[in-house]
């Protein structure tokens, strides 16, 4: 019995087509992805093949103005229109709190939303009961397939799930649910979830009875053969894991941002064994036309976004200096504002011993592309922020050793004075440079804000200690020459859209007046 699994993950509000790098579409003839194009391809496969499932492995939420404005209603609407069969909860589905998940998505979705390792307690238990499920048995042709969901247990550190959701260990939570499916005579089981490729592989290895793993979170690109675009494969598609009980379990993921549609064909025998698995992600490029009816719907929903862009978010009573003359040479107040917003967006009081789980921010000065003049009645709009942060990036959470941070700060000033973008703006860090010293030895003082303290204060950086840092995804990926971050990071979780982080902060503060205050000397 042959099953076709179509899958997406980490779409992050890319409802419209995008450029090849998943930023705003500029030249339509070269654009990719988007739900209208996705629908064309899905329908083409549904017409051609008998047993098809369309699955999403989480993180539909967060990433463009679509989410900022529609807050998840757009996800429910267009996923319903595409007739998704199931979705796993990702960490970003909790970005607007549990209410921001329940009302726009859980109550509106016409497909099951899954996670076996999230357990509700207290008053939330009855409120959320039945709105998401540990598993769902889906009829597919003459057969039935069990889908069991999972979500990163790091979600409390990455989003805002509140105190009434417990995130359990994925493997511990999945096994009894898979066992239950087996007792229901369901012998074809897909684990669909959002914990990253390493956890996907562990689930394939450790959870008895799981036949296929469809993952997300790590934006992993897998491909067999010559890849069709710029993404470099992390392995073959599907990636085959040998389980502890001796079975070959295919593991798949489909990069991110709706650029690809994962396409996996599985042949099962009567016992539910995977006899063969093959496929590849399908690049959703302009050779695939956008579906006219979905496109028309997108255009209708788009109108509200254009109006939103010019509305006031808050006010500034000072000049927000985002000029390259400042931000690439010294501490600039736009850099301070952005870093403060980044830390504020990551306030998670999950442990009495810590005032917060992260206190530090770094931001390449070259990523700040425009100032904002306060003389326009102090008004700040989304449009203004889009000029400051035009690249559609995210502010991510990483874990780095102190020694890596020291290297990063040395790199920040290794060719100081040439107006290059690697000069770092900071938050929760005091750095002192001596530019008379030779490159690689210019950081003379590096103090960082404590987290395991009730009164935050600055302590010297320890080389062997592991620190959490918020930074742009551009830096996490080694951009502007920060190869040491990419090579040495111990953990990387993608965060919220950069503009959204700053806009939310400004809306919250109402009036802002960031200063230059001696963070960088």
């Amino acid at each position: 019995w042959e099953l076709t699994i179509l899958h997406t993950n980490d779409v992050h509000s890319r409802l419209e087509q995008t450029s090849e790098d998943s930023s705003k579409c500029v030249n339509a003839s070269r654009c990719m992805g988007g739900v209208a194009r996705l629908f064309t391809k899905v329908q083409q496969i549904r017409r051609a093949e008998p047993n098809v499932l369309l699955l999403d492995a989480g993180d539909q939420y967060q990433g463009t103005i679509w989410f900022t404005v529609y807050k998840g209603a757009e996800v429910a609407h267009f996923m319903n229109a595409l007739r998704y069969d199931a979705m796993a909860l990702g960490n970003h589905e909790f970005d607007n709190g549990v209410e921001g998940l329940i009302e726009p998505l859980l109550k509106e979705a016409k497909f099951p939303i899954l996670s076996a390792n999230i357990k509700a307690k207290g008053p939330l238990a009855s409120q959320i009961s039945g709105l998401y499920l540990p598993y769902k048995v889906l009829p597919v042709g003459d057969e039935v397939v069990g889908i069991v969901g999972y979500t990163s247990k790091e979600t409390p550190f990455l989003s805002n799930p509140g105190t009434n959701l417990v995130f359990e260990d994925e493997i511990t939570a999945l096994q009894p649910e898979v066992d239950k499916l087996k007792t229901l005579n369901v012998n074809k089981i897909i684990a669909l979830g959002h914990s990253g490729f390493e956890m996907d592989k562990l689930i394939a290895q450790k959870v008895r009875g799981v036949d296929v793993v469809v993952g997300g979170h790590s934006n992993t690109f897998l491909y067999t053969g010559n890849p069709p675009s710029k993404e470099v494969p992390a392995g073959k598609y599907p990636f085959i894991v040998t389980s502890d009980d001796g079975r070959k379990v295919p593991v798949v993921q489909a990069y991110a941002f709706g650029k690809y549609l994962g396409y996996l064909k599985i042949e099962f025998d009567e016992r539910g064994n995977v006899i063969s698995s093959h496929g590849n992600p399908i690049l959703l490029n302009s050779s695939i036309p956008e579906d006219p009816s979905i496109k028309a719907d997108i255009n209708k929903w788009r109108i509200k976004l254009d109006n939103y862009s010019t509305q006031e978010l808050g006010k500034t009573i000072v000049y927000l200096d985002g000029s390259s003359q400042s931000c690439r040479f010294r501490e600039c107040n736009m850099g301070n504002l952005i870093c403060d917003a980044m830390i504020n967006n990551n306030l998670r009081h999950t442990d009495e011993m810590f005032w917060n789980h992260v206190s530090m921010c770094i931001l390449n000065g070259g990523g700040i592309r425009s100032p904002i003049d306060e003389r326009n009645n102090g008004t700040i709009t989304w449009e203004n922020l889009a000029a400051v942060l035009p690249f559609g990036g995210t502010f991510d959470l990483v874990q780095l050793k102190g020694s890596t941070l020291k290297k990063a700060f040395e790199h920040s000033v290794h060719r100081y004075g040439q107006s290059t973008g690697e000069f770092l703006q900071v938050g929760g860090i005091h750095v002192v440079y001596d530019l008379s010293r030779k490159p690689g030895d210019r950081v003379v003082k590096l103090d960082v804000l404590c987290t395991k303290c009730r009164v935050p204060s600055y302590d010297p950086l320890k080389m062997d200690e592991v620190y959490k840092v918020i930074l742009p995804n551009f830096l996490a990926n080694g951009g502007d020459g920060f190869q040491m971050i990419k090579d040495e990071l111990l953990r990387h979780d993608s965060g919220d859209q950069d503009i959204n982080v700053v806009s939310t902060y400004i809306s919250k503060m109402k009036v802002i007046y960031p200063a230059v205050e001696g963070r960088i000397k």
Partner: antibody
Amino acid sequence: EVQLVQSGAEVKKPGASVKVSCKASGYTFTAYFMNWVMQAPGQSLEWIGRIYHNNGDTFYSQKFKGRATLTVDKSTSTVYMELRSLRSEDTAVYYCATSYVGDWGQGTTVTVSS
Amino acid sequence: DIQMTQSPSSLSASVGDRVTITCRASQDIGDSLNWLQQKPGKAPKRLIYATSSLDSGVPSRFSGSGSGTEYTLTISSLQPEDFATYYCLQYASFPWTFGGGTKVEIK
């Protein structure tokens, strides 16, 4: 649990035909196909052909094409193998086996003797 | 048709021995190979499917490997109940074909 139950042993004269049945249970019958395999005394296994339960599509080994016919009765989840123009070398145990031979019938002994 | 050449045709071994049986295909069969065990008077039983996946209930001392045209069944430590005849089966293309069998006997 998958189960395949075959009909009983048969003794046939050369030139006659034999029809062996295989009743399946424990799985979604229409979603799969059935293989037939023969094993002559003291010999290896030999694949005869297969039938897709849903629409009756068949595929035969060249050696048995024209002499073997596979049929299906969906209402009773039963598959049949008919072998015509029997000769002494057709004396063997005939097995039905699921799609990828994960489960087998108990075998039906067919003896061709004058 | 794809020919499956199985070797050895028989072998004598003792309990605890490591036993290796090989199947060579006349052309590339990808991963489309099963290993079956048959005891006298019984129907065959599948041990391994898709070259290396172990059927449920089959002891972990059985393992399969290989690719292209060369495939191997290994029994890491032979047990009394493992004395039987073993067959490979390719299902990469029609007609499906079996190897000639390997009879594992007590030394």
